[in-house]
């Protein structure tokens, strides 16, 4: 039975040109965690295995790092990275556990304008 | 670097048995799942078996459950493929092939035949 | 279980040449798809997981793209030496399956 749930940072923002952490959590449970698969959109970003280590997609190298944790580090973000990205968590002996988290990537200047007029 | 070498196919009478092996070297062999896939002869690719690093997890092909057993011994970096009740539509080269991350086999041995006939 | 259909089962075209081979999955297999290369008496040689990600030491004349359902592998000027059958593969689920090959042949 698979008692465990996925913690994200939910729907999150950043500024083009910057970096965004995305992270996922898994409590609730003492499967262990053997593999963890990023994804974006049916591609593959990034896989952290336990045995192997990390394993980072050739196409997304220069803009994507490891870390911190089982999390993954996006950097020089364009509007295009704007989207649903997943984590996907292998575990034995409960099986996937998969998270969701949206990111929505704005321009400089949006991102500015939208701070300046938060209610407080 | 990275050699897999498989070993212990022949030919077999249909019904018999053989046991299969393959010699692992250049990396860590307890970190990686290995598969087992066959080629008949003049045709394409077929999945048998699968095991993980610790032998915890282990799938077969429909085609050959319960006749074939895959295992390994990490101590000897190796894999082992026990065939029995062989038949002739078993006749194939076998490979093993080094699987990271479960989802690509990037390296493949020169493969055994198997001949399975009277 | 996951059916793998490739086409063309065969082709044949000159060195230089811009080369296409597709494969469909019939159920969405995300990313799940790596693409081999096979000359005769050889094994399998990986070119291209995860759909779109270049083995290394693989040249760079080798693309695939794709996802879901569809699938593509290109060469983008064919050498004497990618002469070979291919074979597309999911690796979604079990059973692991492959496509029935491509044999790219000299016209």
């Known amino acids: 039975m698979m008692t465990g749930t996925i913690e994200t940072t939910g729907n999150i923002s950043a500024e083009k040109g910057g970096s965004i952490i995305l992270q996922c959590h898994l409590s609730s449970t003492t499967a262990q965690v053997t593999q963890v698969n990023w994804e974006q959109q049916d591609q593959l970003l990034a896989i952290c295995n336990a045995d192997l280590g990390w394993h980072i997609s050739p196409s997304f190298k220069d803009r994507v790092a490891p870390g911190p944790g089982l999390g993954l580090t996006l950097q020089s973000l364009t509007v295009n990275d704007t989207g649903e990205y997943f984590c996907i968590y292998h575990t034995y002996p409960d099986g996937t556990y998969t998270g969701r988290i949206f990111l929505e990537v704005l321009e400089s200047s949006v991102a500015e304008h939208g701070a300046r007029f938060q209610i407080p | 670097e990275v050699q897999l070498l498989e070993s212990g196919g022949g030919l077999v009478q249909p019904g018999g048995s053989l046991r299969l092996s393959c010699a692992a070297s250049?990396?860590?062999?307890?970190?990686?799942?290995m598969h087992w896939v066959r080629q008949a002869p003049g045709k394409g690719l077929e999945w048998v078996a699968y095991?993980?690093?610790?032998?915890?997890?282990?799938y077969y092909a429909d085609s050959v459950k319960g006749r074939f057993t895959i295992s390994r011994d990490n101590s000897k970096n190796t894999l082992y493929l026990q065939m029995n009740s062989l038949r002739a539509e078993d006749t194939a080269v076998y490979y093993c092939a080094r699987v990271p991350y479960s989802v690509w086999l990037d390296y493949w041995g020169q493969g055994t035949l198997v001949t399975v006939s009277s | 279980d996951i059916q793998m259909t490739q086409s063309p089962s065969s082709l044949s075209a000159s060195v230089g040449d811009r080369v296409t081979i597709t494969c469909r999955a019939s159920?969405?297999?995300?990313?799940?798809l790596n693409w081999y290369q096979q000359k005769p008496g050889k094994a399998p040689k990986l070119l291209i997981y995860?759909?779109?990600s270049l083995q290394s030491g693989v040249p760079s004349r080798f693309s695939g793209s794709g996802s879901g359902t569809d699938f593509t592998l290109t060469i983008s000027s064919l050498q004497p030496e990618d002469f070979a059958t291919y074979y597309c593969q999911q690796s979604y689920s079990t059973p692991l399956t492959f496509g029935g090959g491509t044999k790219v042949e000299i016209k």
């Open positions: 250049g990396f860590t062999f307890n970190s990686y799942a």
């Open positions: 095991i993980s690093g610790n032998a915890g997890s282990i």
């Open positions: 159920q969405s297999i995300s990313y799940y």
């Open positions: 995860a759909a779109s």
